[in-house]
């Protein structure tokens, strides 16, 4: 990090040090040096000396000055050339930032993930502010009026536990930094309704060689919610649109899907619930792979982390969500 | 954990162009200027391009000037290199390197990515 | 340009002993008081590292063996006690002025 200069001067920013990106500004130098009426004063950002745009003002004071200065970060010092000195001396330094105020915070969401014991907030923060930018969530009880309130710099996690005031709250976001602040419009939860059940996992698939090949696919979840609607959509790897199935679920055994697929391509399948009738949806599982046989029966497991082709027998792996640009959360 | 990785080098002939790419994580890349450092197959190291935060500023030796272009994408978190008018002495091992201040006057590269390799040849 | 003349091109030490690498800048890279004068090692297959920034200070994490020293022009890095794990190359660079420039390099290895 930045060390501290032992200044033998001072140097400042007009308007401010952090100051909207965009803006003209001027930074002054001012030199206090013993015995040294400065022959010249020079300006360094970065480290790199600056040529242009540098007005000295009176013996001791100098002002560089920036049209429409767009970079995020800079730090910046000042030396004076003092006669019968070899080297030019540190005067002072000083980093500066700009950026831009928040926007409104939006899409504001909290969700509780089963067995997380955590309420989880996020939001939409709007364009890059480049500087330091808190966020503030406020959650008020909709039954005791009390309120408590959270600092965080992204999302924030809210144990269960000290959500003490009954079902019922209100959340919004406050966004701040040293150019603005903003409030987002306020959220109304109830706990037993933004609950996401426990994910839904993808264990294996077999293709059966009946007269018409038919795939089943095994998958479960941890859950305990009695009333679950499930999605399963599956594609060729080739193709571009998912198919997708619905199904009404109870997770006291493990699932099977059955699918009539074409013989020898290789589908990729993904899964996500939510409670019925809720607003949330889990993400979508990590991609699930198995090939479709020729004639041989085949199962896919999880068990090794590449395809394995073997007498007749595929075993694929699940490769994790990142590999698929449509693999997003879909809350909300 | 600071990660540079370098993408888009390959071979051309002369006189042609390639664009690389330098992908940052682990740190706020918009606060960092950044550099360029290629390093010959005789092993020397040559600086050839930096740029401030915010691409303001850009600076490159006379070897390459006229030639590179150095760009960022402070939301992509990503460093570009575009050369054109490529040489044969142009062929190197091409580093992005993050510039840190130790002091506000004192700026090394602290941290380098594992580089992307450009071959000119006819 | 600021010229880097890195000396000497290889050097073999013997485990324990003392590396001695020096550089010489065309001219001063001193300036308000500080040298601008860094060190790095680059291993086969991987990107230089920083070992010494300001003519004598260490990077993080790097070992107490390393040490630089020097003003103006004439700077040297020591090694010492030289351990099996330091045979690289060496390099060091000016950071005083644009263009920023290295030495040819120093190929350490062990007698």
């Known amino acids: 990090g930045i060390t501290n200069i032992n200044c033998s001067g001072h140097i400042w920013v007009e308007p401010a040090t952090i100051f909207k990106m965009g803006m003209n500004i001027s930074i002054y130098c001012q030199a206090a040096i013993k015995n040294c009426q400065p022959r010249k004063l020079h300006f360094y950002k970065n480290g790199i000396k600056e040529r242009f745009q540098i007005t000295r003002i009176n013996k001791t004071t100098a002002r560089l000055w920036y049209k429409n200065f767009l970079e995020p970060h800079a730090s910046m010092y000042c030396t004076a050339e003092c006669p019968k000195h070899f080297q030019e001396t540190l005067i002072c330094g000083k980093d500066i930032s700009s950026g831009y105020p928040p926007d409104i915070p939006d899409e504001v969401t909290c969700v509780i993930y089963e067995y997380s014991g955590n309420m989880t907030c996020t939001w939409n923060a709007g364009k890059l502010t480049y500087i330091d930018t808190k966020y503030v969530v406020h959650v008020k009880s909709l039954e005791t009026e009390e309120e408590q309130q959270y600092l965080t710099s992204s999302y924030i996690n809210i144990s269960t536990d000290s959500l003490q005031g009954g079902k019922k709250y209100l959340v919004w976001v406050q966004a701040a930094n040293a150019l603005g602040m903003e409030e987002s419009k306020q959220l109304q939860i109830h706990l037993d309704d933004i609950v996401i059940p426990s994910a839904a996992v993808i264990s294996r698939a077999e293709t059966i060689n009946a007269t018409v090949p038919k795939t089943i696919i095994y998958w479960d979840s941890q859950t305990t919610i009695e009333k679950v609607s499930c999605e399963m959509r599956y594609k060729a790897t080739t193709n571009q649109t998912w198919n997708v199935k619905e199904f009404d679920t109870n997770f006291t055994y493990v699932q099977q899907s059955e699918f009539y697929l074409e013989p020898n391509i290789k589908y990729v399948f993904q899964v996500r619930c939510q409670e019925t009738g809720k607003r949330y949806w889990q993400p979508w599982s990590s991609l699930f792979f198995h090939k479709t046989p020729e004639t041989v029966p085949q199962v896919t497991s999880k068990a090794f982390q590449h395809d394995t082709w073997n007498s007749g027998l595929t075993v694929a792996s699940i490769s994790t969500g990142h590999l698929t640009s449509d693999n997003r959360g879909d809350i909300g | 954990e600071v990660k540079l990785v370098e993408s888009g080098g390959g071979s051309v002939k002369p006189g042609g162009s390639l664009k690389l790419s330098c992908a940052a994580s682990g740190f706020t890349f918009s606060r960092y200027t950044m550099s360029w450092v290629r390093q010959t197959p005789e092993k020397r190291l040559e600086w050839v391009a930096y740029?401030?935060?915010?691409?303001?500023?850009?600076y490159y030796p006379d070897s390459v000037k006229g030639r590179f272009t150095i760009s960022r994408d402070n939301a992509r978190n990503t460093l570009y290199l575009q050369m054109s008018s490529l040489r044969s002495e142009d062929t190197a091992m091409y580093y992005c390197a993050r510039r840190t201040s130790y002091s506000y006057y004192n700026y090394v590269f602290d941290y380098w990515g594992q580089g992307t390799t450009l071959t000119v040849s006819s | 340009d600021i010229v880097m003349t890195q000396s000497p091109a290889s050097l073999a030490v013997s485990l324990g002993q003392r590396a001695t690498i020096s550089c010489r800048a065309s001219e001063s890279v001193d300036n308000y008081g500080i040298s601008f004068m860094n060190w790095f090692q680059q291993k086969p297959g991987q990107p230089p590292k920083l070992l010494i920034y300001?003519?004598?200070n260490q990077g993080s994490g790097v070992p107490a063996r390393f040490s630089g020293s020097g003003s103006g022009t004439d700077f040297s890095l020591n090694i010492h006690p030289m351990e099996e794990d330091d045979t690289a190359m060496y390099f060091c660079q000016q950071s005083k002025e644009v263009p920023w420039t290295f030495g040819a390099g120093t190929k350490l290895e062990l007698k």
């Open positions: 740029i401030s935060t915010g691409g303001g500023d850009t």
């Open positions: 300001a003519a004598s």
